[in-house]
Interface confidence: medium
């Protein structure tokens, strides 16, 4: 268990041309607030998917009224941190979405109007218990500066908040199975905390964050009875005699999500997946149009100007998500063939090909020997994306341009002497040996272990290796 903390430092116009106009005016004073959504892992989920690690809303910032003629300054921010408590282990890698909302305080009928001013998203690695990490994110012409950290709530410790410590009951020892919890010398590890929401009656755990079901129960939180033959309905009758139980009311019962949003249960409560054009914890906030600049990373916004019409972001290559907020890892599709190295340059995909292959995706197998000459009578041999020369006798090297020393490998056996020859090498054998490499002993009676020596060569003569 622990808390993710987000500190917003500034929200204002980013550097460069095209400074945004102030979101507030004398006629329409407003104030800002922020929403953070956290998801575990380096999530590629859509922006609308549940904030499985949790979400938080900031307080409202001070009321701001634009000074006529002045450029948009950094806008006044709400006090305090945004805190997202997590009950289970801190995942180490997480995805975040930080939304900047504007609350207009003019004379609206029905109270203040909310609209999304900017949304930034990212994926990060973060160990719990570490220092504050600083970040800058840009959304259109706006720039958001913030810091974040994850810290464990006692008794949890460690980079994932999974080591659970509690004060020792005695100075000398811990309880059964409770090891001393370094570096806290006076503490001991404590019982595991199961996955948040794990039924205390029907579930248990032997690892932090897990939820194992007792017999007769199922579901991720062990709240669903295993149906038996005596259960007539899918959820089972509410009768003690049948052994079937109706789970208690779920957080999504009655669907708390407005405007057609769909509800999904989370360990904490529920999460609404909102249709395009609606936001908020219960999809109660509408009014995002192309005028609000909801498309990031150069996405093209298409949609009507009235608040009720949905907008669509057409994303440039390399980005996806309903607001083009997520970079696509196009290399994960392994587009480069034949072992080519994939490089995602943002604006384009590049394949760096291995030798012997070419083409945008390294799809062409080059003729390795085309245009490759092997010198001194060598012949080119193709293979494995690289050419190789089979050199004529007396030559070596990649292209057969180097004259070889045939005697370098000491080819003559039994003390024979090697002589380089224009056509190869010649071995002068020591007495008692014969053969091209002096490899055969001469028998005492003058016969050899080989067939008779070729005509013109007596045993003991130098043998030329052709």
């Amino acid at each position: 268990a622990g808390v993710f903390e987000l500190q917003i430092h500034s929200f204002g116009p980013g550097p460069g041309p095209g400074a945004p106009r102030s979101p507030c005016s004398a006629r329409l004073p407003c104030r800002l607030f922020f929403r953070v959504c956290l998801k575990p892992g380096l999530s590629e989920e859509a922006a609308e998917s549940p904030c499985a690690l949790g979400a938080a809303l900031s307080a409202r910032g001070p009321v701001y009224t634009e000074q006529p003629g002045a450029p948009a300054p950094d806008l006044p921010l709400p006090d305090g941190l945004l805190q997202v408590p997590f009950r289970d282990a801190w995942p180490g890698t997480f995805s975040f979405i930080i939304e900047t909302w504007r609350e207009e305080l003019g004379d609206q009928i029905g109270g203040p109007a909310w609209s999304l001013l900017a949304r930034v998203a990212g994926r990060r690695r973060l160990a719990a218990g570490g220092p504050w990490a600083r970040d800058i994110q840009r959304a259109g012409a706006w720039e958001l500066r913030f810091s974040y950290r994850a810290r464990c709530e006692p008794p949890a410790v460690g980079t994932a908040c999974t080591r659970l410590c509690r004060p020792r009951s005695a100075p000398s020892r811990c309880g059964p199975g409770l090891r001393p919890c370094a570096p806290l010398e006076d503490e001991c590890e404590a019982p595991l905390v199961c996955r948040a929401g794990c039924s205390p009656e029907h579930g248990f755990c032997e690892q932090p964050g897990e939820c194992r079901c007792l017999e007769g129960w199922t579901g991720p939180l062990c709240t669903v009875p295993v149906s038996t033959s005596s259960c007539l309905s899918p959820r089972g009758p509410s009768s003690a005699t049948t052994g079937c139980l109706v789970p208690g009311p779920g957080p999504c019962d009655g669907n708390p999500c407005a405007n057609g949003g769909s509800c999904s249960e989370t360990p904490r409560s529920f999460e609404c997946t909102c249709p395009r054009g609606f936001y908020g914890l219960r999809c109660e906030v509408s009014g995002v149009t192309c005028a609000d600049g909801p498309c990031f990373n150069g996405g093209l916004c298409v949609g009507g100007a009235d608040p009720d019409s949905a907008y669509i972001c057409h994303c440039p290559p390399g980005f996806q998500g309903s607001n083009c907020e997520k970079r696509v890892d196009r290399c994960s599709l392994q587009p480069c063939r034949n072992g080519g190295l994939c490089l995602d340059l943002g604006h384009a995909l590049r394949c760096r090909c291995r030798a012997g292959f070419a083409g945008p995706r390294c799809e062409h197998d080059l003729d390795d020997c085309a245009g490759r000459a092997c010198a001194n009578g060598g012949t080119c041999v193709e293979g494995g994306g690289a050419h190789r020369c089979s050199c004529a006798l007396g030559f070596g090297g990649r292209d057969c341009r180097e004259r070889a020393d045939p005697c370098a490998a000491r080819p003559c056996a039994h003390g024979g002497r090697c002589y380089a020859h224009f056509s190869g090498l010649v071995c002068a054998c020591a007495p008692g040996y014969m053969g091209a490499r002096c490899e055969f002993p001469v028998h005492p009676d003058g016969a050899s272990a080989l067939p008779a020596a070729p005509p013109g060569l007596r045993p003991g003569d130098p043998q030329r290796y052709l």
């Epitope: 006692p154 659970l164 009951s169 309880g175 019982p191 595991l192 199961c194 248990f204 755990c205 017999e215």
Partner: antibody, heavy 120, light 112 residues
Framework: EVQLVESGGGLVKPGGSLKLSCAAS????????MSWVRQTPEKRLEWVAA????????YYPDTVKDRFTISRDNAKNTLYLQMSSLRSEDTALYYC?????????????WGQGTSVTVSS | NIMMTQSPSSLAVSAGEKVTMSCKSS????????????LAWYQQKPGQSPKLLIY???TRESGVPDRFTGSGSGTDFTLTISSVQAEDLAVYYC????????FGGGTKLEIK
């Protein structure tokens, strides 16, 4: 129906050894932590040893540490307690008990017990 | 180890009466990370093994009559029998399972 049947108890001299067994049935034995709990002649209950579901972790109070060893054979649905260097204060009725889940859960089923008497 | 102290050590009541018995722990058995009290109550009838009545200090085990109620938090706990029946004659033990495992000395309930 959950059933736990202990065996192996008896009379043993101080310093002697004894091995208790507990045959489990009526539930998925390999899913539950198990314990041995004893009841003294004065009717006091004392926890003796525990083991997690896969046998990878064992737990003992100081009174029996290094003398008693708990183990389990999930294939045979059997829990064991090897007792050595027995003392007169180990005389008790020994119960095999099932936890509701892991170690940090209440015991929900008990066997009928097997009697161990340590006397010279 | 956490010491568990039960009181009274014995009591005698008539059938139909309400009875309460106390269990105190030398340290808190409330675990802050999940806000659970690691305390159980057991009933042991003469010649029988203990039977689980209550766990997490107040959760009644399935099949246990609803006249049995557990309450309390931290170090002070109570088992209440709202209307004692003749079959409730037993010794009642409290048990903490947070740090090691220790039992109270028991409260013997007799029926007048």
């Amino acid at each position: 129906e959950v059933q736990l049947v202990e065996s192996g108890g008896g009379l043993v001299k101080p310093g002697g050894s004894l091995k208790l067994s507990c045959a489990a049935s009526g539930f998925t034995f390999s899913s539950y932590a198990m314990s041995w709990v004893r009841q003294t002649p004065e009717k006091r209950l004392e926890w003796v040893a525990a083991i997690n579901s896969n046998g990878g972790n064992t737990y003992y109070p100081d009174t029996v540490k290094d003398r008693f060893t708990i183990s389990r054979d999930n294939a045979k649905n059997t829990l064991y307690l090897q007792m050595s260097s027995l003392r007169s204060e180990d005389t008790a009725l020994y119960y095999c008990a099932r936890h509701r889940g892991g170690f940090y859960y209440a015991v929900d089923y008990w066997g009928q017990g097997t009697s161990v008497t340590v006397s010279s | 180890n956490i010491m568990m102290t039960q009181s009274p050590s014995s009591l005698a009541v008539s059938a139909g009466e309400k009875v309460t018995m106390s269990c105190k722990s030398s340290q808190s058995v409330l675990y802050s990370s999940n806000q659970k009290n690691y305390l159980a109550w057991y009933q042991q009838k003469p010649g029988q093994s203990p039977k689980l009545l209550i766990y997490w200090a107040s959760t009644r085990e399935s099949g246990v009559p609803d006249r049995f109620t557990g309450s309390g938090s931290g170090t002070d706990f109570t088992l209440t029998i709202s209307s004692v029946q003749a079959e409730d004659l037993a010794v009642y033990y409290c048990h903490q399972y947070l740090s090691s495992r220790t039992f109270g000395g028991g409260t013997k309930l007799e029926i007048k």
